[in-house]
């Protein structure tokens, strides 16, 4: 008479988190008499997953009615699978004995791997703004996925980026994993409206990648260009000098007029003109009473933008 | 009569997280009498997944009615699979015995791998803004995917980037994985509207990659260019000098006019003109009363942009 064999037909089974996992096991004989148990892992530390006759295993159901006469199918289903359920599950036949039942034979084990979706990628930009031509770093993080294989791409305005470094943690076996990527993006003056996208592809996403975005407007500082010009005036004793502050971002801007180095007026830019590229322009003007000056006057338009060091442009006003 | 064999027909099974995994096991004989168990893993530390006779395994269902006469199918289904269920599952036949049932024969094992989607890629940019021509780093992270194989690409405005480094963790076997990529992007003045995209492709995504984005506007600082010019004035004793601050980003800008090095007026740019490329322009003007000056006046337009060191441009106003 042939000795009983425990057949676990699948070496591995992959199940999505939240679903049920079916672990199949069949016996080739009804003898010896004794219970079947399911364990996760092997050896002394193995975990009892299901005991046919006693114990409490609310997540486990049997595929067949185990106690039906001559039943040889001992497949089980474990509900609401989480990454923590990953491991190798063994279908073990015990032989009745005294004082304890004796393990008779084990299936070869079925490795259960759990597919868990990564969390929505969170993209974070630099803490401090940078100016065009500089490189800023954006990080992208996602967690809780399994298996470990994952693809992360970075895009800027639809164009794939290549200067990035990605880590998937932990390095060893784990029930779930996290990904962390840092992309280096070179800023351009036109990046106020730009967006970086972190795109994650994983087996669980069924071809529909997750995306996290960050706006470069939060990371960029486009310093203004200044232009000081004299406007025509009808009044003979007055000069109108304008300071055109162009193409700056973000908004915060304070302008100071100096006459021969002395502060004449300070303004905080409020009503800005927004350019198509997201930068702003602003104009300030200074009416200078030429009668009050014997000599030529140097008018300086000094701009402090976004808390940065002031830049200025001067204009020599000729007193005729 | 031939000895019972435990047949696990599939060496491996791959299941999406959340789904059910079917682990197939069949016996070649009804003898010896004894229970079937499913285990994950082998050896002493194996984990009982299903025990035909005792215990409670709510996630496990049997594919066949195990107790039907002459049943040899001991396949199981495990519901709601997560990455933690990954492992090798063994269908094990036990022979009834005394004092205990004895493990009789095991199937060859079925490896269950869980396909889990990566989380939405999270793209984060640099903490500090950088200026054009500089290189910034963006990171992209995604987590929770399985299997480990994953593809990550970076784009900037639709153009694929090549300067990036990607890591998938952990390096060894795991129920799920994380990806972390850092891309280096060279900023250009036109990058205010640019976007970096991190694109992740994974077997679970069925060809529809996940994308995470970040805007270069958050990472770039485009310093302004200054131009100081004198505008024609009808009034003989007044000069109007304008400072055109051009192509800067972000908005924050403060302008100071100096006359012969002395602060005349300070303004904070508010109403900005936005250029197509996302940078801003602003103009400030200074009216200089030429009567108050005997000699020529040097007017300086000094601009502080985004907290950076001030830049300035001077204009010599001739007092005739």
């Amino acid at each position: 008479e042939d000795e009983l064999q425990v057949i676990q037909p699948e070496k591995s089974v992959s199940v999505a988190a939240g679903e049920s996992a079916t672990l199949r096991c069949a016996m080739t004989s009804l003898i010896p008499v004794g219970p079947i148990m399911w364990f996760r892992g092997a050896g002394a530390g193995r975990e009892l997953i299901y005991n046919q006759k006693e114990g409490h295993f609310p997540r486990v159901t049997t595929v067949s009615e185990l106690t039906k006469r001559n039943n040889l199918d001992f497949s089980i289903s474990i509900s609401n699978i989480t990454p923590a359920d990953a491991g190798t599950y063994y279908c073990v036949k015990f032989r009745k004995g005294s004082p304890d039942d004796v393990e008779f034979k084990s299936g070869a084990g079925t490795e259960l791997s759990v597919r868990a979706k990564p969390s929505a990628p969170v993209v974070s930009g630099p803490a401090v703004r940078a100016t065009p031509e500089h490189t800023v770093s954006f990080t992208c993080e996602s967690h809780g996925f399994s298996p470990r294989d994952i693809t992360l791409k970075w895009f800027k305005n639809g164009n794939e980026l290549s200067d990035f470094q990605t880590n998937v943690d932990p390095a060893g076996d784990s029930v779930s994993y996290s990904i962390h990527s840092t992309a280096r993006v070179v800023l351009t003056r036109g990046d106020v409206h730009s967006q970086v996208i972190c795109e994650i592809a994983h087996i669980t996403l069924q071809g529909d990648p997750l995306r996290g975005t960050a706006n470069l407007s939060e990371a960029i500082r486009v310093p203004p260009t200044l232009e000081v010009t004299q406007q025509p005036m009808r009044a003979e004793n007055q000069a109108n000098v304008t300071c055109q502050v162009s193409n700056f971002y973000p908004r915060g801007l304070q302008l100071t007029w100096l006459e021969n180095g002395n502060v004449s007026r300070t303004e905080t830019a409020s009503t800005l003109i927004e350019n198509k590229d997201g930068t702003y322009n602003w104009m300030s003007w200074l009416l200078v009473n030429t009668c009050a000056h014997r000599d030529d006057v140097v008018l300086t338009c000094q701009v402090e933008h976004d808390g940065q060091q002031a830049v200025s442009k001067s204009y020599a006003l000729e007193i005729s | 009569e031939d000895e019972l064999q435990v047949i696990q027909p599939e060496k491996s099974v791959s299941v999406a997280a959340g789904e059910s995994a079917t682990l197939r096991c069949a016996m070649t004989s009804l003898i010896p009498v004894g229970p079937i168990m499913w285990f994950r893993g082998a050896g002493a530390g194996r984990e009982l997944i299903y025990n035909q006779k005792e215990g409670h395994f709510p996630r496990v269902t049997t594919v066949s009615e195990l107790t039907k006469r002459n049943n040899l199918d001991f396949s199981i289904s495990i519901s709601n699979i997560t990455p933690a269920d990954a492992g090798t599952y063994y269908c094990v036949k036990f022979r009834k015995g005394s004092p205990d049932d004895v493990e009789f024969k095991s199937g060859a094992g079925t490896e269950l791998s869980v396909r889990a989607k990566p989380s939405a890629p999270v793209v984060s940019g640099p903490a500090v803004r950088a200026t054009p021509e500089h290189t910034v780093s963006f990171t992209c992270e995604s987590h929770g995917f399985s299997p480990r194989d994953i593809t990550l690409k970076w784009f900037k405005n639709g153009n694929e980037l090549s300067d990036f480094q990607t890591n998938v963790d952990p390096a060894g076997d795991s129920v799920s994985y994380s990806i972390h990529s850092t891309a280096r992007v060279v900023l250009t003045r036109g990058d205010v509207h640019s976007q970096v995209i991190c694109e992740i492709a994974h077997i679970t995504l069925q060809g529809d990659p996940l994308r995470g984005t970040a805007n270069l506007s958050e990472a770039i600082r485009v310093p302004p260019t200054l131009e100081v010019t004198q505008q024609p004035m009808r009034a003989e004793n007044q000069a109007n000098v304008t400072c055109q601050v051009s192509n800067f980003y972000p908005r924050g800008l403060q302008l100071t006019w100096l006359e012969n090095g002395n602060v005349s007026r300070t303004e904070t740019a508010s109403t900005l003109i936005e250029n197509k490329d996302g940078t801003y322009n602003w103009m400030s003007w200074l009216l200089v009363n030429t009567c108050a000056h005997r000699d020529d006046v040097v007017l300086t337009c000094q601009v502080e942009h985004d907290g950076q060191q001030a830049v300035s441009k001077s204009y010599a106003l001739e007092i005739s």
């Epitope: 364990f39 997953i49 006759k53 006693e54 114990g55 106690t67 304890d100 | -």
Partner: antibody, heavy 113, light 108 residues
Framework: EVQLVQSGAEVKKPGATVKISCKAS????????MHWVQQAPGKGLEWIGR????????KYAPKFQGRVTITADTSTNTAYMELSSLRSEDTAVYYC??????WGQGTLVTVSS | EIVLTQSPATLSLSPGERATLSCSAS???????LYWYQQKPGQAPKLWIY???NLASGIPARFSGSGSGTDYTLTISSLEPEDFAVYYC?????????FGQGTKLEIK
């Protein structure tokens, strides 16, 4: 719904034998081990033994070995526990349970002369 | 025979306090086979925690179980009035199955 209904209270004289029944509903007793547990007044729980109704195999605690017999009738879905040579210290509540998870309401056995 | 020793025999605490009940085994018990039961006067024991750390259906999350080998613990993070009862640990790792002598959790 799983239910275990035990027979009523018993008063026995020392040396007598008591047989308690545990009728199951909501499941087939052949599918599970049926256990019996003793609880003396003001004391803790003590495992007596169990039966596999499928093949009538039993296990007993050494303390009760020789005096206890656990049986099952699968046709009526009922498990039984018989305790002989009763003594005063056998005065207790006796519980049946299904596979350690579901318990009967208990049967009080009083042994008194 | 595996002897389970519970400590303390009696634990007097007030509602809102944290309770820690210990169960020590004379030899190693697999965590899969260590159960806890709650019993109130005049009632049958109720399965409370199974496989060391899993709460039975309907058991509040303030209860938790932990341990391995020979040392196991039942913890109640913040006692509610209905938690005062006797708690038994139980092993079914090897025959004969055994119970601890119980810990009586009483209101201070």
């Amino acid at each position: 719904e799983v239910q275990l209904v035990q027979s009523g209270a018993e008063v026995k004289k020392p040396g007598a034998t008591v047989k308690i029944s545990c009728k199951a509903s909501g499941f087939n007793i052949k599918d599970y081990y049926m256990h019996w547990v003793q609880q003396a007044p003001g004391k803790g729980l003590e495992w007596i033994g169990r039966i596999d109704p499928e093949d009538a195999e039993t296990k007993y605690a050494p303390k009760f070995q020789g005096r206890v017999t656990i049986t099952a009738d699968t046709s009526t879905n009922t498990a039984y526990m018989e305790l002989s040579s009763l003594r005063s210290e056998d005065t207790a509540v006796y519980y049946c349970d299904r596979g350690l998870a579901y318990w009967g309401q208990g049967t009080l056995v009083t042994v008194s002369s | 025979e595996i002897v389970l020793t519970q400590s303390p025999a009696t634990l007097s605490l007030s509602p809102g306090e944290r309770a820690t009940l210990s169960c020590s085994a004379s030899s190693s018990v697999s965590s899969s086979y260590l159960y806890w039961y709650q019993q109130k006067p005049g009632q049958a024991p109720k399965l409370w925690i199974y496989s060391t750390s899993n709460l039975a259906s309907g058991i509040p999350a303030r209860f938790s179980g932990s341990g391995s080998g020979t040392d196991y613990t039942l913890t109640i993070s913040s006692l509610e009035p209905e938690d005062f009862a006797v708690y038994y640990c139980h092993q079914w790792s090897s025959y004969p199955y055994t119970f601890g002598q119980g810990t009586k959790l009483e209101i201070k």
